[in-house]
């Protein structure tokens, strides 16, 4: 749980955050796990600790290993582990899988590629972007803050994109690169006002007290990939996260399905151990895109117990 994988290239800067989070005022000590030797905090060292961050300026292959961070409050010490691997620079253009960050998908309407890990660094715009090692040039490519936007995305825009930026530490500059794959969904699509497929508006669902129940909010937004298309549940007009009821959880992530070419999104509200007070709540399925917001309301009612009357002759 409190171990995190990090990687980088030799002669580049690498900054790693302690996986164990604490209040910002807490002291963080870093150690080489194998030797238990403390990592210095003085910035004149090539590898040094700076609060929650461990900095390799620049990194060397020999830095690879497990690092221990101990977050210290006035009364508690809590431990995390950073598993760091530094690789030699590749002689050719090929970026091996082990250096790749998570793949992102895009379409004509949504082509943002975020530069991974950049938030950890002290950098200034603009970012440099490369595709398959070639510098990106032309008006179709816009480096905006920490991401790249591609206009009029086409299928041959798929590939490996590398962001390159300069980390500045006390006036010294260090190069950082990070690569991720970009895939393109090839659909000519359109967007329209959301249509909620489920639940029906003002629907009532029968439930049994003490049982679990699921409510599905499903809406379609047009055809093909959508720039903005979200569905969510609200309880009495409040976000689920603001409701502070651990029994009622909205499914993490949203399932995107394409039925008959339509872009439809579902999210499930899971209610564990249904209580009487759940019957008093208003459950709103909200579907939102650039065209607007549509809302369908569903309420829960107690399932009538089946009569089990015996007939005596």
């Amino acid at each position: 749980k409190f171990s995190k994988q990090s990687w980088g290239l030799e002669n580049e800067a690498l900054i790693v955050r302690c996986p164990r989070q604490g209040k910002s005022s807490y002291i963080v000590d870093w150690y080489y796990s194998q030797t238990n030797k403390s990592i210095p905090t003085q910035e004149r060292n090539r590898v040094f600790a700076s609060g929650q961050l461990l900095k390799f300026l620049p990194a060397e292959v020999a830095d690879s290993g497990i690092y221990t961070c101990i977050v210290r409050s006035p009364t508690f010490n809590r431990t995390g582990y950073a598993n760091v691997t530094i690789y030699k620079k590749q002689p050719d253009c090929n970026v091996p899988d082990y250096l790749m960050y998570s793949t992102v998908s895009g379409s004509e309407k949504n082509s943002k590629i975020y530069c991974p890990t950049i938030d950890l660094y002290n950098w200034t715009a603009p970012l440099e972007w490369f595709k398959n090692c070639q510098a990106l040039q032309g008006s179709r490519y816009k480096a905006h803050k920490s991401f790249l936007v591609i206009d009029n995305v086409m299928t041959d825009d798929a590939g490996d994109y590398t962001c390159k930026f300069i980390h500045n530490e006390n006036g010294a500059n260090y190069s950082v690169t990070a690569t991720r794959s970009f895939t393109v969904k090839d659909e000519q699509g359109f967007s329209r006002f959301p249509v909620i497929r489920a639940p029906a508006h003002n629907e009532t669902k029968e439930v049994e007290i003490g049982e679990n129940t699921n409510l599905t909010c499903s809406a379609c937004f047009g055809k093909g990939a959508q720039f903005l298309a979200t569905v969510q549940w609200q309880l009495n007009g409040n976000k689920i996260t603001d409701f502070s009821e651990p029994r009622i959880q909205q499914e993490e992530g949203q399932n995107q399905s394409f039925s008959n070419g339509l872009a439809c999104v579902n999210t499930v509200l899971r209610i564990a151990d249904v209580k009487e007070e759940d019957l008093l709540l208003r459950y709103d399925c909200l579907a939102l895109n650039l065209h607007g917001l549509r809302r369908h309301t569903i309420r829960l009612s107690r399932k009538n117990p089946i009569d089990h009357q015996s007939t005596y002759c």
Partner: antibody, heavy 123, light 107 residues
């Protein structure tokens, strides 16, 4: 020295109300999450409610939701528990306690506890 | 909610003996588990956090182990002041839950 001192307990009839207070000293009250835990006579510990530090988000056990309200006044270093519609099963010693670590979305242990205040719900 | 089951309910031992208390979670709590000691008429006192770390001022005879769903509190050699009720508590998710307690009594 960290100190938590509960007050406001007593005998109340079913359906009645009580407001418990917990006066904190010896630490920067506003940055810590605070918790109420209760213990029925001869029974185990039961978490009742939590409140975040400056953010103020609140959490409740199912058994008290809709009847109890946790709040805090950081300017007075005081935690409160407003208890309405009291039932016989709410009879317990109520402790306030401090969560010394929790960050948004997480919880931790209770490192300091008050001495408790007894709430008796009976007709 | 996560249910914590402690065993045994009561442990009858003599001073100087080793006490082994168990706490089992209904689902994984990683290492987000604590142990408390409570004496009659007193508030609980934190002994162990993150499954195995001793809280400040807790004697070395108290140790915690385990992760996931099975946890153990061990008192290596019981002192007279150790006879009390011990509770485990998980804090991986709300609602925070406690075990029902294990009473360590003098044999």
């Amino acid at each position: 020295e960290v100190q938590l001192l509960e007050s406001g307990g007593g005998l109340v009839q079913p359906g009645g109300s009580l407001r418990l207070s917990c006066a904190a000293s010896g630490f920067t009250f506003s940055i810590y999450d605070m918790i109420w835990v209760r213990q029925a006579p001869g029974k185990g510990l039961e978490w009742v409610s939590s409140i975040r530090g400056e953010g103020g988000g609140t959490y409740y056990a199912d058994s008290v939701k809709g009847r109890f309200t946790i709040s805090r006044d950081n300017s007075k270093n005081t935690l409160y528990l407003q208890m309405n519609s009291l039932r016989a099963e709410d009879t317990a010693v109520y402790y306030c306690a401090r969560d010394p670590w929790s960050t948004e979305g997480s919880f931790f242990v209770l490192d300091y506890w008050g001495q408790g205040t007894l709430v008796t719900v009976s007709s | 909610e996560i249910v914590l089951t402690q065993s045994p309910a009561t442990l009858s031992l003599s001073p100087g003996e080793r006490a082994t208390l168990s706490c089992r979670a209904s689902q994984s709590v990683d290492d987000d588990l604590a142990w408390y000691q409570q004496k009659p008429g007193q508030a609980p006192r934190l002994l162990i956090y993150d499954a195995s770390n001793r809280a400040t001022g807790i004697p070395a005879r108290f140790s915690g182990s385990g992760s996931g769903t099975d946890f153990t509190l061990t008192i290596s050699s019981l002192e007279p002041e150790d006879f009390a009720v011990y509770y485990c508590q998980q804090y991986i998710t709300a609602p925070l839950t406690f075990g029902q307690g294990t009473k360590v009594e003098i044999k």
